[in-house]
Interface confidence: low
């Protein structure tokens, strides 16, 4: 790498995946191992992040841009750039800090990440329920007694029954 | 609940070959790493390296790689560093740890730490 | 290997001051910084994670702060449990590294 010669600041020509090296007389050095710059003029290269134990590497550090992770199976991100990675859960479960629990009766959750959610209340759009929610999935909402042609016969689902061992927390 | 037990002291010649032991409960020992962490009287700490108990895939820090070896032993959940040709330099406190819960971001903290083992270097 | 740099080596102060104390990385550790407490004859015990996250069961009254190369801890209204040492450690790159560790005793 050349030595540099801007006038006004001797850094400024280094490329990205070098760094302008003060202690060698502000000449551009590539950035050591296992760091990168992903941006010309820098003092400092940074240090590439390390996808180890639950995370993989989803893209290799190169000198010029950092290591991008994912997690491993049973895991999902979260955070920008996941920074973090959280356990999965069965849908119909919610991650809590004492482990996946089951969703309370009246909620679902049809990803393996994210809380459980109440189930849509089709009374408040004048509908009935079609389709009685689960711990999976939610109530499906019919049309309301008053869209069906006269004469025809509305049948109104029973109300859900609880799932044999699962009570409301 | 997590517990990590060590032996409290250790008297060891000079150049004679000490092993320390980490004997672990409470949780499944090859799901989590193990680290040593070194402290001499009065001084800070020092991380000397982890093993990966599922496969024994460990990690060293340089300034120990050549003295200090990690091993486990699953079927009585127990780690172990061997310390080989010790000097006065190597009296500490020897500290087994183990790393928070796998999937949260404290991965890579030190949540559970045994009692330590002191050892003496002294002829 | 990253650096780790800690100050003050020793502070004294008084029940229900504040105190700071400082870590400097060689490097952008980018968070990844924890924090333990260390009462004497004991083994250290996590205070903070990811620079700011309290562990499960540490008070208020502590604070950690500081992004890229600068982090610190704060104790509010210090307590007399709380004098003891206080080590920062990164955990960004291996080898993982400490600072020279804190004393903090009453004045």
């Known amino acids: 790498f050349e030595r540099t010669r801007s006038l006004q600041d001797p850094c400024s020509n280094c490329p990205a995946g070098t760094f302008c090296d003060n202690n060698r007389n502000q000449i551009c050095s590539p950035c050591p191992p296992n760091s990168f710059s992903s941006a010309g003029g820098q003092r400092t290269c940074d240090i590439c992040r390390q996808c180890k134990g639950v995370f993989r590497t989803r893209k290799e550090c190169s000198s010029t841009s950092n290591a991008e992770c994912d997690c491993t199976p049973g895991f999902h991100c979260l955070g920008a750039g996941c920074s973090m990675c959280e356990q999965d859960c069965k849908q119909g479960q919610e991650l809590t800090k004492k482990g996946c629990k089951d969703c309370c009766f009246g909620t679902f959750n049809d990803q393996k990440r994210g809380i459980c959610r109440p189930w849509t209340n089709c009374s408040l759009d004048g509908k009935s329920v079609l389709v009685n929610g689960t711990k999976e999935r939610d109530v499906v909402c019919g049309p309301s007694p008053a869209d069906l042609s006269p004469g025809a016969s509305s049948v109104t689902p029973p109300a859900p029954a609880r799932e044999p061992g699962h009570s409301p927390q | 609940q997590v517990q990590l037990q060590q032996p409290g002291a250790e008297l060891v010649r000079p150049g004679a070959s000490v092993k320390l032991s980490c004997k672990a409960s409470g949780y499944t020992f090859t799901s989590y790493w193990i680290n040593w962490v070194k402290q001499r009287p009065g001084q800070g700490l020092e991380w000397i390296g982890n093993i990966f108990p599922s496969d024994s895939y460990t990690n060293y820090n340089q300034k120990f790689k050549d003295r200090a070896k990690l091993t486990v032993d699953k079927s009585s959940s127990t780690a172990y560093m061997q310390l080989s040709s010790p000097t006065s330099e190597d009296s500490a406190v020897y500290y087994c740890t183990r790393f928070g819960s796998s999937g949260y971001p404290d991965y890579y903290t030190m949540e559970y730490w045994g009692q330590g083992t002191s050892v003496t270097v002294s002829s | 290997d990253i650096q780790m740099t800690q100050s003050p080596a020793s502070l004294s102060a008084s029940v229900g001051e504040t105190v700071t104390i400082t870590c400097r990385a060689s490097g952008n550790i980018d968070n990844y910084l924890a924090w333990y407490q260390q009462k004497q004859g004991k083994s250290p015990q996590l205070l903070v994670y990811?620079?700011?996250t309290l562990a499960e069961g540490v008070p208020s009254r502590f604070s950690g702060s500081g992004s890229g190369t600068e982090y610190s801890l704060k104790i509010n209204s210090l307590q007399p449990e709380d004098f003891g040492s206080y080590h920062c450690?990164?955990?960004?790159?291996?080898?993982?590294?400490f600072g020279g560790g804190t004393k903090l005793e009453i004045k």
């Open positions: 990811n620079a700011k």
């Open positions: 450690q990164q955990y960004w790159t291996i080898p993982y590294t």
